[in-house]
């Protein structure tokens, strides 16, 4: 899977959208790596 910063950001945005934003506060692009997915 793509692990560039932009890919990680878009993947996280999709995850946040699907979860209704109910995730930990520190679950932000600069805190998670591609392995988080």
């Amino acid at each position: 899977a793509c692990d560039t910063a932009t890919c990680v950001t878009h993947r996280l945005a999709g995850l946040l959208s699907r979860s209704g934003g109910v995730v930990k506060n520190n679950f932000v692009p600069t805190n998670v790596g591609s392995k988080a997915f």
């Epitope: 950001t9 878009h10 945005a13 932000v28 692009p29 600069t30």
Partner: antibody, heavy 119, light 107 residues
Framework: EVQLVQSGAEVKKPGASVKVSCKAS????????MNWVRQAPGQRLEWIGD????????NYNQKFKGRATLTVDKSASTAYMELSSLRSEDTAVYYC????????????WGQGTTVTVSS | DIQMTQSPSSLSASVGDRVTITCKAS??????VAWFQQKPGKAPKSLIY???YRYSGVPSRFSGSGSGTDFTLTISSLQPEDFATYYC?????????FGGGTKVEIK
Amino acid sequence: EVQLVQSGAEVKKPGASVKVSCKASGYTFTDYYMNWVRQAPGQRLEWIGDINPNNVGTNYNQKFKGRATLTVDKSASTAYMELSSLRSEDTAVYYCASIIIVPNYFDYWGQGTTVTVSS
Amino acid sequence: DIQMTQSPSSLSASVGDRVTITCKASQNVDTNVAWFQQKPGKAPKSLIYSASYRYSGVPSRFSGSGSGTDFTLTISSLQPEDFATYYCQQYNNYPYTFGGGTKVEIK
């Protein structure tokens, strides 16, 4: 309102260095990567690199490795791009850009900083 | 580096026309492609990410498609404010790379 506000135009001599700033507001600066892109007159956009303001990790386009340095000042929510050993081909508009998720999912760009390299 | 080849480099069209711009990657980039609009003297404006998703506020007449190596940006009914230069970008691999641009001019 998310804003990326860049420093003003610069005129430099060949061999000199330039440092462009990008002041972020309206979001949590350390949560999102900052990209730097340039555009020489009449040319395509060219990616310089990105920086993680949280841990200051960087990725550089090899074309600029060793000449470009990306840094941040977390306390001032400001990103910097320094380019050294300037040559005439570095004359371009330099942009900072960041994809933000909160408060609004969008790819925000600074207004651009014109750097002119001329003897 | 991945090369992004855009075509055409320029085109002339009229208000109301359907416009299609293509972008070909030199290797597989999955759907990790973005499209930007740029007007003279202005910063690029993001339109599309992940090949086919519109950012909020981008008019529905803009649509993107494609995966792998072949991508398309379509403007279904060209409006006066759409005359600009459009760029594709791949962000699947470092360094991110952009296409050469397509200038959409008034016929």
